[in-house]
């Protein structure tokens, strides 16, 4: 058969029909629609839109639409008791506050609900002492203040600059350092670009506003109350004492204004070079403590936030698959919002509603994918990815079995420059080909392809002429489906000039003014970006869901596992006695690299020449490219991570947000030079050497001739 | 819009004390600092002193140490200079103005002037 | 005190036509963090100074482009690319990298 019979497709009903159907008005319209309130995780609000999404993609055309519910632990302030941090004298007296909320931006001054900045799952907990300046809390800023400047933040409330790391890390960072507070503020260095206003005249972070965000250590668990296995009517939850990824210090962000006035006071030792200084004008003397007249002053905090037990609801919906139907490709992305979500998570949403859209009005003109098509609202995802992940552990069965590809759908846009896209090189291709049949939004470059735009504006660092795609990290919805179940997943959004905007993240993420008029007025007044990561988005799911064989290209999974490894082998090398020593080898790993080529290679010509007309075989080559996702994937889990199982990448153990290649290998070598055993760290290293070598080998075998 | 509005013109007589209020409106009194400057007869602008509504935190230039005291209230986001131990030379035009945050940190916003005449 | 000097003491210029006052400080205005905190004010007959130039060479809000600052260190520049009639007044350079202090200041009136 040809494919327009195989999944009962008339001429009209193509990638074209589908990308042509999408339209930015839409997007925009959606947009405004699904930000004129706050939907919290947790909240009636974020229900009430839970039901309306359910009831829209209805009409849409999805076969069926369900809510999945889960009781999971979210964390909230205390309405009547609320977080701040103080400035006590010698007598204990308060002589400076930090402000209670952000100021309402314009229009939003009557707005309910809008939850005041806080740092979810905070314990409770009022300690007073000396401050510390850590700089971003990275594990090299606190290397540096107690092994260089022999700062001990033992007992000390430390303050730390948001940015370059997943918040949850330098939380961690700081417990691990023994300090008893964390206070986290924006420094303009990283949310504050040059020349541009502040909200809002435009798309800078004002010196009241505030980034929320949770600071767990989940590490893939979901639920903290329910790692494994699903937050249903009859699990079983641990108590909180056991808790998994909770902090055990309490925790307050601020912003820029209220971070001046604790860090102007700041005594103690001088920053220890440029890198630390931010823009405020202050010294940013690292402490403890502050300076002269100051000195018997101490710093406060007030935090009463609760964790509480709350019902949160995922969106499913199905469009069923023409001819395989038990072969699912999903497409998801959140719907809760600290506040208002005018970028993050509702510039994603606005574009999946806006999918689900263009679908189902082909559905509706008879047409169906050749694969099952799922679409995910997910709930909870600010706490922790805790609806997606709830979901996936309920369905982890149908998923390892049935999932071919996952693409995420967060926030649409994170700058106006160019495409970003993330994903598993099994995509590399499908995201190449789809990027050369879309037209680029840039401007000079009309008429050009979209390829063409973010090639040139973000080259690839190996490959000329290619566009940089990046690993793989974590901090999103994706993190279940690749890093513990193996399903082959990607990402892509629109995104800021990284080499003249050294701001990290955009300025206004997760704060009140993270707005509709923010998107609106300043970063896609046309909706033009956005419809551009829809037609990204929407295209590569339709290419996953409609394509005869799927549009995974194994020879890019050899070419990166071969880069992977010169890296990994490159670390090592740089203790070359320490190796001689204790015999550590890569000759494992590197060999089942080059069988993993050779077998990757002739799978692919066979790819190229089998008899497409017969549907075992059909079946059997495309099972093999699905399951290669899978086969990197250990049971086992990486050390102390369990829910980390993808053996070539995981989030990074210093920094949620990025991706780690060989990441067992990585961490064992981590610091090595300082552990107390060098034998036994050394061992560790050949174990993950060992690991590494044998799921590389394992998952070529997997693309050799079956008999 | 931020707004600066200072008390009415004083006349005193030598070794007397003078306070001026700022009244501040249309922003977060609490976050930025209050500068207190004056101006004597066809001369230039000379500084007197600061304070932060936030935490009552002063900063005085030296030369008027001891004689000027700058206070707030926040309940009414008001700034007060009283300069005691009046002399004909302190007679000048005295404003108050907003030390700008980051990313100015200049004194972007000033009060209309308040006219303080010491004479006998 | 960091002392400000500025030059000329009064500029007399012709509409349209260029103007430059320049400003020196006793010391350096780099601030530890590496910004210098050098501003300048136009005071306008009769009125309160205003902000023009924030941190050498940031125009402040409303601030028409024709006026523009440079400079660094020691030695800092404010250009009037055209002079305009509603111009005129006297010019202050500031600094508040230190205990703020001003110069004596810069008349601009017209010829």
């Known amino acids: 058969k040809s494919s327009n019979e195989a999944t009962n497709i008339t001429p009209k009903h193509n990638m074209k029909a589908f990308l042509d159907e999408l339209k930015a008005e839409n997007i925009k319209k959606f947009l405004y629609n699904f930000t004129q309130i706050p939907h919290l995780a947790g909240t009636e609000q974020n229900f009430q839109l839970a039901k309306q999404i359910q009831s829209q993609w209805k009409e849409f055309g999805l076969d069926s639409v369900e809510l999945a519910h889960y009781d999971v632990l979210l964390s909230y302030p205390n309405k009547t008791h609320p977080n701040y941090i103080s400035i006590i004298n010698e007598d204990g007296n308060e002589i400076f506050n930090t402000s209670l909320f952000e100021p309402p931006p314009p229009g939003y001054e009557n707005v309910s609900d809008i939850v005041p900045p806080f740092s979810a799952f905070s314990p409770q907990g009022m300690p007073e002492g000396d401050l510390v300046y850590v700089n971003y809390a990275r594990t090299e800023d606190f290397f540096k203040l107690e092994r260089d400047m022999k700062i001990n933040c033992s007992g000390k409330i430390v303050i730390a600059r948001y940015g370059k790391v997943f918040r949850g890390n330098k939380v961690k960072n700081a417990q691990l350092a023994g300090a008893k507070g964390v206070i986290l503020y924006s420094d303009p260095a990283d949310y504050f670009a040059p020349g541009v206003k502040s909200y809002p005249d435009g798309w800078n972070l004002p010196g009241g506003g505030v980034q929320r965000g949770n600071i767990l250590n989940l590490n893939g668990a979901g639920d903290p109350l329910t790692p494994g296995y699903p937050a249903n009517e009859y699990a079983y939850r641990r108590g909180i004492a056991e808790a998994v990824g909770l902090p055990s210090i309490p925790v307050h962000p601020i912003g820029y204004y209220d971070a001046q006035k604790l860090l102007e006071k700041m005594g103690g030792s001088a920053p220890p070079d440029s890198s630390w200084r931010g823009s405020l004008k202050v010294p940013y003397n690292v402490g403890p403590g502050f300076t002269g007249n100051f000195s018997t002053q101490k710093v406060k905090m007030h935090i009463h936030s609760t964790n509480e037990v709350t019902r949160i609801y995922n969106v499913i919906g199905t469009l069923r698959g023409a001819v395989e139907p038990d072969r699912y490709v999903i497409l998801g992305g959140h719907r809760d919002s600290w506040v208002f979500g005018g970028i993050d998570p509702q510039s994603g949403a606005a574009v999946v509603h806006e999918i689900v859209r263009s679908f189902g009005t082909l559905k509706k003109e008879g047409w169906r994918p050749r694969r099952t098509i799922l679409f995910a609202s997910w709930d909870a995802e600010e706490f922790g990815l805790l609806g997606s992940t709830e979901w996936a552990e309920e369905n982890s069965r149908l998923l390892q079995e049935r999932g071919v590809a996952y693409i995420n759908a967060d926030s649409s846009i994170e700058g106006n420059y160019t495409l970003r896209v993330d994903c598993t090189p099994l995509m590399y291709s499908l995201v190449h080909n789809l990027t050369k049949e879309l037209k680029s939004p840039d401007e000079g470059f009309e008429g050009k392809s979209l390829y063409e735009s973010w090639t040139k504006k973000s080259p690839s660092p190996e490959f000329s002429g290619m566009p940089r795609i990046s690993k793989l990290g974590s901090g999103n919805d994706f993190e279940v489906f690749f890093q513990r179940l193996g399903i082959a997943s990607g990402r892509a959004r629109y995104t800021k000039n990284w080499e003249t905007n050294k701001f990290s993240g955009y300025p206004l993420y997760h704060s009140v003014y993270e707005t509709y008029e923010l998107v609106e007025k300043f970063y896609d007044p046309m909706f033009k970006y956005h419809l551009t990561v829809a037609q990204v988005r929407g295209g590569m799911v339709f290419e996953l869901a409609n394509s005869i064989v799927l549009p995974f290209d194994c020879r890019d999974y050899a070419v990166v596992l071969r880069k992977y490894a010169d890296k990994i082998y490159s670390i090592s090398m740089k203790h070359p006695q320490e190796m001689k020593t204790y015999s550590v080898s890569f000759d494992s790993l590197f060999s089942a690299v080059k069988n993993f080529t050779e077998i990757a290679s002739k799978f692919s010509e066979r790819l190229q020449d089998f008899d497409k007309s017969n549907p075992i075989v059909l079946r059997m080559m495309n099972d093999q490219l699905m399951f290669l996702e899978r086969a990197f994937i250990d049971p086992l889990g990486l050390p102390d991570r369990p829910f980390y199982r993808h053996v070539i990448y995981a989030p990074s153990s210093h920094n949620k947000y990025a991706g780690e290649s060989f990441p067992g290998i990585y961490d064992a070598l981590f610091d090595i030079e300082s552990k107390v055993d060098p034998s036994k760290a050394w061992g560790e290293v050949k174990r993950q050497i060992y690991v590494a070598a044998f799921t590389v080998q394992a998952a070529a075998e997997t693309l050799s001739e079956v008999a | 819009q931020v707004q600066l509005v200072q008390s009415g013109a004083e006349v005193k007589k030598p070794g007397a004390s003078v306070k001026v209020s700022c009244k501040a409106s249309g922003y977060t009194f609490t976050y930025f600092d209050i500068n207190w400057l004056r101006q004597a007869p066809g001369q230039g602008l000379e500084w007197m002193g600061g304070i932060s509504p936030g935490d009552s935190n002063v900063n005085y230039a030296q030369k008027f140490q001891g004689r000027v005291t700058l206070t707030i209230d926040t309940s009414t986001s008001t700034a007060y200079m009283e300069l005691s131990s009046l002399r004909s030379e302190d007679t000048a035009v005295y404003y108050c103005a907003r030390d700008g945050n980051f990313p100015y940190y200049a004194m972007d916003s000033w009060g209309q002037g308040t006219l303080v005449t010491v004479s006998s | 005190d960091i002392v400000m000097t500025q030059s000329p003491l009064s500029l007399p210029v012709t509409p349209g036509e260029p103007a430059s006052i320049s400003c020196r400080s006793s010391?350096?205005?780099?601030?530890?963090?590496?910004?210098?905190?050098l501003h300048w004010y136009l005071q306008k007959p009769g009125q309160s100074p205003q902000l023009l130039i924030y941190?050498?060479?940031n125009r402040f809000s409303g601030v028409p482009d024709r006026f523009s600052g440079s400079g660094s260190g020691t030695d800092f520049t404010l250009k009037i690319s055209r002079v305009e009639a509603e111009d005129v007044g006297v010019y202050y350079c500031?600094?508040?990298?230190?205990?703020?202090?001003f110069g004596g200041g810069t008349k601009v009136e017209i010829k």
């Open positions: 941190t050498v060479s």
């Open positions: 010391q350096s205005l780099v601030h530890s963090n590496g910004q210098t905190y």
């Open positions: 500031s600094q508040s990298t230190h205990v703020p202090t």
